[in-house]
Interface confidence: medium
């Protein structure tokens, strides 16, 4: 069957970060906004502690992706944007006694945007 | 004071596994604010990092190692391990361990502590 | 990955002189979110571990005279020594810490005339 259609961004974390319409089912399996929305409040206390500026963009790339009527796929951040926000949030996560994600993990994310591997750039 | 002091085997074949253990002592490896990791240097060579483990297992590995590396820690025997495979002649080297401090405050974030560092010979 | 590069890569200094070491970096050490530089300073002496001398671009490491300063921004990066000891003799490296794998250069030596 066909892609779903984009929607709109509704998760107030994920609003006003540059792109506006989403896809489900996103990066993780989530078939919703809300019940992604419920996971990523999870990561709210990291994000407001301004660990790394890319993190709340980064997490919304794979909770509520980009999506364009283009492109049949969601399309997550690359994989540079996900090393520098675990590099500089990781530590943080350590000192609460949380390890980083393996939901999150960097190296399922493309190297670089290129035609085949569609990813956003910081 | 915090004491790092590697231990395993010197001698180690062509193709097989090298393995490598460090012992903390003088605090607790569960510490907050620190990674702990493995650096190695070949002979009259430079320093090299090869990856790095939290309290928790989370990994950072380097890209040109990743493949055959594996690194673990043990925080009821307060130590962490390093597990190389499918050595060659090139990973002869001083094989160092480190802490790596983390000020979650300012950021600041160095190699602070190191163990006196062990040579490996791969050789057959 | 990041490319740091030494110059000179040995150095011979009369003791009571100024020495200076350059680290130069592929890419920016500074990380734009916090204002840190992401450059430290290691010393190894002759058959030990190395020790860390500065970090984040000038602080000085517990323990360090204040006779070692270290100082530059983005890419290009320096090591004073103002007045050198005997006991400052081995191999200095930079690293930086900015971005995985973190990486050294390939270290400066210093020896005593």
């Known amino acids: 069957r066909g892609a779903a259609p984009c929607q709109a961004v509704e998760i107030p974390m994920c609003r006003g970060i540059g792109y506006n319409l989403t896809r489900m089912p996103n990066l993780l399996g989530h078939t919703s906004q809300g019940e992604a929305a419920a996971e990523l409040a999870e990561f709210a206390p990291l994000v407001q502690y301004g660990c790394h500026s890319h993190l709340r963009f980064f997490l919304c790339s794979l909770y509520a992706p980009m999506c364009t009527d283009q492109v049949s796929t969601p399309i997550p951040a690359c994989r540079p944007m996900c090393e520098q926000a675990r590099l500089r949030c990781a530590p943080i996560m350590e000192q609460f006694n949380f390890g980083w994600p393996d939901s999150l993990d960097c190296a399922r994310l493309p190297t670089r945007n290129d035609p085949h591997a569609l990813c956003m750039e910081a | 004071q915090l004491q790092l002091q590697e231990s395993g085997s010197g001698l180690v074949k062509p193709s097989q596994t090298l393995s490598l253990t460090c012992a903390v002592s003088?605090?607790?490896?569960?510490?907050?604010?620190?990674?702990w990791s493995w650096i190695r240097q070949p002979p009259g060579k430079g320093l090299e990092w090869i990856g790095s483990?939290?309290?928790?297992?989370?990994?950072y590995y380097n890209p040109s190692l990743k493949s055959r590396l594996t690194i673990s820690v043990d925080t009821s025997k307060n130590q962490f391990s390093l597990k190389l495979s499918s050595v060659t002649a090139a990973d002869t080297a001083v094989y160092y361990c480190?802490?790596?401090?983390?000020?979650?405050?300012?950021?600041?974030?160095?190699?602070?502590?190191w163990g006196q560092g062990t040579l490996v010979t791969v050789s057959s | 990955d990041i490319v740091m590069t030494h110059t000179p890569l040995s150095l011979s200094v009369t003791p009571g002189e100024p020495a200076s070491i350059s680290c130069r970096s592929s890419?920016?050490?500074?990380?734009?979110?916090?204002?840190?530089?992401?450059l430290d300073w290691y010393l190894q002496k002759p058959g030990q571990s190395p020790q860390l001398l500065i970090h984040t671009l000038s602080h000085r490491a517990s323990g360090v005279p204040d006779r070692f300063s270290g100082s530059g921004s983005g890419t290009d990066f320096t090591l004073k020594i103002s007045r050198v000891e005997a006991e400052d003799v081995g191999v200095y490296y930079c690293m930086q810490s900015i971005q995985l794998p973190w990486t050294f250069g390939q270290g400066t030596k210093v020896e005593i005339k």
């Open positions: 890419r920016s050490l500074l990380d734009t979110d916090d204002g840190n530089t992401y």
């Open positions: 480190a802490r790596f401090y983390y000020d979650i405050l300012t950021g600041y974030s160095y190699f602070d502590y």
């Open positions: 003088g605090g607790s490896i569960s510490s907050g604010g620190y990674s």
């Open positions: 483990i939290y309290h928790s297992g989370s990994t």
